[in-house]
């Protein structure tokens, strides 16, 4: 099966790499514009230059193209705790990230929020905090993991999953009580 190609891909595939087919004359291959520029006018004929113009401030193209307009620069989302790692240039979009000791939680493919890395109080760091993943904690004896925090087994209710983790602690308490009654 031949994969389906869109009209633009079909037109481009007729020309060698780095060129595109003239939209009004399919016998002409025009040179694509470099990154940081956009297509102002198609080449007038074979071997003639494509008219490419540099992107204006606040816009960019990150690869060779024949776009009629540059792409708008992304803005970092302050409400999601994002900070600007590098500002937008004519050939590169804004790079957004998180502060030190924070990680990204992706709500969707292109939307992330910054959260503080867990410190593993009353536990130890099993896996360090990564760019896109919180610290993985292992809790000390007498503590259980709840919402990635080590919580005292004294807060463990019978109905919760923690009963399995806190069972030895509970049994030890019972054993101590029993030995005290003899």
């Amino acid at each position: 099966l031949v994969p389906h190609l869109g009209d633009r891909e079909k037109r481009d595939s007729v020309c060698p790499q780095g060129k595109y087919i003239h939209p009004q004359n399919n016998s002409i291959c025009c040179t694509k514009c470099h990154k940081g520029t956009y297509l102002y006018n198609d080449c007038p004929g074979p071997g003639q230059d494509t008219d490419c113009r540099e992107c204006e401030s606040g816009s960019f193209t990150a690869s060779e193209n024949h776009l009629r307009h540059c792409l708008s620069c992304s803005k970092c989302r302050k409400e999601m705790g994002q900070v600007e790692i590098s500002s937008c240039t004519v050939d590169r979009d804004t790079v957004c990230g998180c502060r030190k000791n924070q990680y990204r939680h992706y709500w969707s493919e292109n939307l992330f929020q910054c959260f503080n890395c867990s410190l593993c109080l009353n536990g130890t760091v099993h896996l360090s905090c990564q760019e896109k993943q919180n610290t993985v904690c292992t809790c000390h004896a007498g503590f259980f993991l709840r919402e990635n925090e080590c919580v005292s087994c004294s807060n463990c209710k019978k109905s919760l999953e923690c009963t399995k983790l806190c069972l030895p602690q509970i049994e030890n308490v019972k054993g101590t009580e029993d030995s005290g009654t003899t």
Partner: nanobody, 120 residues
Framework: EVQLLESGGGLVQPGGSLRLSCAAS????????MGWVRQAPGKGLEWVSM????????YYADSVKGRFTISRDNSKNTLYLQMNSLRAEDTAVYYC?????????????WGQGTLVTVSS
């Protein structure tokens, strides 16, 4: 077919509380983050809150931080929004929304909405 059915809206006095619910069906609830969006009269849509599947990550708009609490019950396929210390500016239609995993649009399905009116 994805269905999101909101309930719990109504008229409440400033300083009062309401709890909105959203019953979800037609998709695997435990695979998607969920959220609440609102639209005040004559205004655009505003994200209110979001929650991931296990409830470990939440987002709140600055305008509702400390007053609203989002939660979910995965066993009941239900999303909640507890709204306390309500203000006149919280008057809006509140929509339950399923968060898309792809693309730049956060939400891909919405409910019909429930009207919250804060007035004395």
């Amino acid at each position: 077919e994805v269905q999101l059915l909101e309930s719990g809206g109504g008229l409440v006095q400033p300083g009062g509380s309401l709890r909105l619910s959203c019953a979800a069906s037609g998709f695997t609830f435990t695979r998607y983050s969920m959220g609440w969006v609102r639209q005040a009269p004559g205004k655009g849509l505003e994200w209110v809150s979001m929650i991931d599947v296990p409830g470990l990550h939440t987002y709140y708009a600055d305008s509702v931080k400390g007053r609203f609490t989002i939660s979910r019950d995965n066993s009941k396929n239900t999303l909640y929004l507890q709204m306390n210390s309500l203000r006149a500016e919280d008057t809006a239609v509140y929509y339950c929304a399923k968060i898309s995993q792809f693309g730049s649009n956060a939400f891909d399905y919405w409910g019909q909405g429930t009207l919250v009116t804060v007035s004395s």
